[in-house]
């Protein structure tokens, strides 16, 4: 029985040319996490974090993706095309697969600065 839940950073926005951290956290389960896969909206893999072997960043993203912090992922040099859904897929034993969703909106610099100015602290 799958008892775990995934908490994510939810809907986030970031500035074009900037960077953003994608974070997921699996809780409420004793299952062993064997692998965490990070996927983009078009279902292409960005990175794999294996519990014993560490990180594998996919060749197409090596320039713009940095591992961490933790099991999270940092996207750098953001473009407007990076807007969309991102998924963290936790492969666990014996539970199976848990999946979290994050929506990233990449904003033009001026828009991002404007919206940040009016955020509630």
């Amino acid at each position: 029985m799958m008892t775990g839940t995934i908490e994510t950073t939810g809907n986030i926005s970031a500035k074009k040319g900037g960077s953003v951290i994608l974070q997921c956290h699996l809780s409420s389960t004793m299952a062993q996490v064997t692998q965490v896969n990070w996927e983009q909206h078009d279902h292409s893999l960005l990175a794999i974090r294996n519990a014993e072997l560490g990180w594998h960043i996919y060749p197409a993203f090596k320039d713009r993706v940095a591992p961490g912090p933790g099991l999270g992922l940092t996207l750098q040099s953001l473009t407007m095309n990076d807007t969309g859904e991102y998924f963290c897929t936790y492969h666990t034993y014996p539970d199976g697969t848990y999946r979290g969703r994050i929506f990233l909106e990449v904003l033009e610099s001026s828009v991002a600065e404007h919206s940040a100015r009016f955020q509630i602290p």
Partner: antibody, heavy 120, light 107 residues
């Protein structure tokens, strides 16, 4: 260049423990991942498990209760023990290296393989 | 476990002609797929990783493509030295699993 060489008995009796060793040259086993993969006659290649650069292990759940992978860093070798063997464990056993950082789960160096037959 | 199914089981190709091997995953594995070549009497050798990236030293007549559940290994012009068995493998989730192999022969 990385070289791997399997060694161990070619014949094991049912219910006994299969023991194989892989000697690695040209590379330190304290880097990357060191794997055991087997192929029973006429069947698919099957992942048995691996030991990581740090000494952590992963075992295929289908074999987990019977498998132990260990290493001896002073000799630069790693070993496989498979207990309570049956005829179904008859296979060619390969040791292999995996550079996860660069190639993910793709195995980039393989030993020549050693045939193990389980029979009384 | 994810099941990788290869077709055809065997392939007989005239030298200089193209060859294509298919691999189907039982569930979506994105692009976490590798291809290996096993020549007669030898151990498997890595050819392709991440579905479409050629490993060091692999001739450019070999190419990999696909994502999701359907993957293909193509040889643009088969040469005599290409005979052997070709295997696909997924590493999207553990346990990592292999296809049953496709035997390539020369006509």
């Amino acid at each position: 260049e990385v070289q791997l060489q399997e060694s161990g008995p070619g014949l094991v009796k049912p219910s006994e423990t299969l023991s194989l060793t892989c000697a690695v040259s040209g590379y330190s086993i304290t880097s990357d991942s060191w794997n055991w993969i087997r192929q029973p006659p006429g069947k698919k290649l099957e992942y048995i498990g691996y030991i990581s650069y740090s000494g952590n292990t992963y075992y295929n759940p289908s074999l987990k209760s019977r498998v132990t992978i260990s290493r001896d860093t002073s000799k630069n070798q790693f070993s496989l023990k498979l207990s309570s063997v049956t005829a179904a464990d008859t296979a060619v056993y390969y040791c292999a290296r995996l550079d996860f950082s660069n190639y993910g789960g793709a195995v980039d160096y393989w030993g020549q393989g050693t045939t193990v037959t389980v029979s009384s | 476990d994810i099941v990788m199914t290869q077709t055809p089981l065997s392939l007989s190709v005239t030298p200089g002609q193209p060859a294509s091997i298919s691999c189907k995953a039982s569930q979506n594995v994105r692009t976490a797929v590798a291809w290996y070549q096993q020549k007669p009497g030898q151990s498997p050798q890595l050819m392709i990783y991440s579905a479409s990236y050629r490993y060091t030293g692999v001739p450019d007549r070999f190419s990999g493509s696909g994502s999701g559940t359907d993957f293909t290994l193509k040889i643009s012009r088969v040469e005599a030295e290409d005979v052997g068995v070709y295997y696909c493998q997924q590493y999207y989730t553990t346990p990592w699993t292999f296809g049953g192999g496709t035997k390539v022969e020369i006509k």
